[in-house]
């Protein structure tokens, strides 16, 4: 399977959802749950999904997980997975989503979704 490279519309939708979550955060997101941080590179949407899937009973990120599943419906094969699957540090979900938003905006600005 190739590394998922999203179209502009699907990436824009994810960005809007991440903005909505991170800007409207009133209390610790998902009760302050921790997830594995990532080197958000080539398979970042798959890697992000793999990290967030461990968080259950947190309806706020349910839509984000579904969007990531839509962007990465098939698991990348081992040959396409590199450093983004190194798991050595855990961070709060809120920070994770901010990092994902920042990287997604960079991809969108660079137009590398085509």
């Amino acid at each position: 399977s190739p590394n998922p490279v999203p179209s502009s519309s699907s990436l824009k939708e994810l960005i809007e959802e991440l903005v909505n979550i991170t800007q409207n955060q009133k209390v610790p997101l998902c009760n302050g749950s921790m997830v594995w941080s990532l080197n958000l590179t080539s398979s970042m949407y798959c890697a992000a999904l793999d990290s967030l899937i461990s968080i259950s009973n947190c309806s706020v990120i349910h839509r984000t997980k579904r969007m990531l599943s839509a962007l990465c419906p098939h698991k990348p094969s081992a040959k396409h997975v590199s450093s983004e699957y190194v798991r050595d540090t855990k961070i709060e979900v809120a920070q994770f989503l901010k990092d994902l938003l920042r990287h997604s905006r960079i991809i969108f600005r660079n137009g590398s979704y085509n």
Epitope: P4, P6, L49
Partner: antibody, heavy 118, light 111 residues
């Protein structure tokens, strides 16, 4: 009503081409990955193709280079262009909503029959 | 490719019976602790329907008499008390590796 409706099946000669369509309704089509799965008469299920919401495509080796999956979000439609058809491609072709490797194929159409025969 | 082997290929049972179907993968289908196996029900002339995702999670709207278990290479679908509408063919499917593959199916018939 949330549903998928396939069309375009029929009888085609070996080496011929056919284009299947799948009309989605009742959900935000553009927000989901989609797949085609086939079932030969009296046999089991076989995954044929998938397309992400971002238009990344995936195929098994059995159809790679012959089949092309595509989507038109404006028309809420999924397509499967099938070229160089073989007798072993004879099957009912199902369109399915693909919610990813963690969630499976959550919604299926009723299927359309493709018969490859001379 | 990962082969998914279901057993039995068919079985006869009565309404109220407890039915167990097994699915064995040719290699582990676990990914970061999650088992990427799903179960579907198909009635004659109809499309498949998702019952269980990720080995043990009940899909929304599916009766609680259906349950799934297992990890690694061995998985089980259980129907705790068979109902008339449960007579159908059941398929397991793995999504841990492309190509996604299905088991050969288990046909549950009326005894």
């Amino acid at each position: 009503e949330v549903q998928l409706v396939e069309s375009g099946g029929g009888l085609v000669q070996p080496g011929g081409s056919l284009r299947l369509s799948c009309a989605a309704s009742g959900f935000t089509f553009s927000s989901y990955a989609m797949s085609w799965v086939r079932q030969a008469p009296g046999k089991g299920l076989e995954w044929v193709a998938s397309i992400s919401s971002g238009d990344t495509t995936y195929y098994p080796d059995s159809v790679k280079g012959r089949f092309t999956i595509s989507r038109d979000n404006a028309k809420n439609s999924l397509y499967l262009q099938m070229n160089s058809l073989r007798a072993e491609d004879t099957a009912v072709y199902y369109c399915a909503r693909n919610e990813g490797y963690y969630f499976g194929l959550t919604l299926w159409g009723q299927g359309t029959l493709v018969t490859v025969s001379s | 490719d990962i082969q998914m082997t279901q057993s039995p290929s068919s079985l006869s049972a009565s309404v109220g019976d407890r039915v167990t179907i097994t699915c064995k993968a040719s290699e582990s289908v676990d990914h970061f602790g999650w088992s990427l196996v799903h179960w579907y029900q198909q009635k004659p002339g109809k499309a498949p329907k998702l019952l269980i995702y990720r080995a043990s999670n009940l899909e929304s709207g599916v009766p609680s008499r259906f349950s799934g278990s297992g990890s690694g290479t061995d998985f089980t679908l259980t129907i705790s008390s068979l109902q008339p509408e449960d007579f159908a063919t059941y398929y397991c499917q793995q999504s841990n590796e492309d190509p996604w593959t299905f088991g050969g199916g288990t046909k549950v018939e009326i005894k």
